[in-house]
């Protein structure tokens, strides 16, 4: 799996999970989230060469097509596979609200 | 939806469905598929700017992060959303086989 256990331990040019810490105030200009101040969002990046963690039959076909026809612009792309939620605390006026934001943290990647 | 109805009628630099016909023999070097000779595989390509068909909370956050921090290398990517199968005819020796290959045709795209 192209997850932290694999990707953070290996120097990898191909599609892999990359670390990214987002500070809500500094990086997004969001002041409304009270807690946490930021989180490990991570992201997916890297090349998708022939059969590298291909997600579907189509991405495998596209990967082969791109290998045989390297001048073509059609190639798979490295995107998130497994995501996890993030729980935040914010206020509406003086009323505290706890909310779970779905699909906020990338845990693994794939070529799709 | 970033499907043929929208994407094939509009000149679109952003993430959209792109037409791609794949000839099995010519483009993939596959001689084993008897019918069809090729098919409209299509593919997804194009930029994923702020809020363009963002798929998840993470891709929306990443889209905002990338807009505010354009020097960052973290940005969403244009990938397939809905896929359909393709039915093929091939032979094992002289025995014809009909098989449905899942997820072979891209019908729509998303920024993920």
């Amino acid at each position: 799996a192209l997850d932290a256990a694999y990707c953070f331990r290996n120097v990898q040019d191909n599609c892999c999970l990359r670390p990214l810490y987002i500070d809500f105030k500094r990086d997004l200009g969001w002041k409304w989230i009270h807690e946490p101040k930021g989180y490990n969002a991570n992201f997916c990046a890297g090349a998708c060469p022939y059969l590298w963690s291909s997600d579907t039959q189509h991405s495998r076909v596209l990967s082969l097509y791109n290998t045989i026809n390297p001048e073509a612009s059609a190639s798979p792309c490295c995107v998130s596979q497994d995501l996890e939620p993030l729980t935040i605390l914010y206020y509406i006026g003086k009323t505290p609200k706890i909310e779970q934001l779905s699909n906020m943290i990338v845990k693994s990647c794939k070529c799709s | 939806a970033l499907d043929a109805a929208y994407c094939f009628r509009n000149v679109q630099d952003n993430c959209c469905l792109r037409p791609l016909y794949i000839d099995f023999k010519r483009d993939l070097g596959w001689k084993w598929i008897h019918e069809p000779k090729g098919y409209n595989a299509n593919f997804c390509a194009g930029a994923c700017p702020y809020l363009w068909s963002s798929d998840t909370q993470h891709s929306r956050v990443l889209s905002l992060y990338n807009t505010i921090n354009p020097e960052a290398s973290a940005s969403p990517c244009c990938v397939s959303q809905d896929l359909e199968p393709l039915t093929i005819l091939y032979y094992i020796g002289k025995t014809p086989k009909i098989e449905q290959l899942s997820n072979m045709i891209v019908k729509s795209c998303k920024c993920s």
Epitope: L28, G29, W30, K31, W32, I92 | L51, V61, L64
Partner: nanobody, 116 residues
Framework: QVQLVESGGGLVQPGGSLRLSCAAS????????MAWFRQAPEKQRELVAL???????AYADSVKGRFAISRDNAKNTVYLQMNSLKAGDTAVYYC??????????WGQGTQVTVSS
């Protein structure tokens, strides 16, 4: 019910200025990232300027140094000051409100025409 109402569009000569306003209702405005998009005939809708809930801004390369986005949370309004207008700025300008906890909302648009 969420409403975004744009105003301030019109006909202006090249080199002139306009100030667009977008008044929001039905949302916790201070939590929303606000943006102006535009769409010219036969072209795709493009981001012009963005201001986050905390005041961070971003601009399309084509308008940097000419346009300025601002917001007034007390008035639930976002503004777009457009200076040194060019013919290429002619488009329908749309206001957008986005908060990660909800879907995004769009205004109906206001026409800006730059012509002599």
């Amino acid at each position: 019910q969420v409403q975004l109402v744009e105003s301030g569009g019109g006909l202006v000569q090249p080199g002139g200025s306009l100030r667009l306003s977008c008044a929001a209702s039905g949302i916790t405005f201070s939590h929303y990232d606000m943006a102006w998009f535009r769409q010219a005939p036969e072209k795709q809708r493009e981001l012009v300027a963005l201001i986050t809930s905390g005041g961070k801004t971003a601009y399309a390369d084509s308008v940097k140094g000419r346009f300025a986005i601002s917001r007034d949370n007390a008035k639930n309004t976002v503004y777009l000051q457009m200076n040194s207008l060019k013919a290429g700025d002619t488009a329908v300008y749309y206001c957008n409100a986005h908060w990660v906890l909800t879907s995004q909302y769009w205004g109906q648009g206001t026409q800006v025409t730059v012509s002599s």
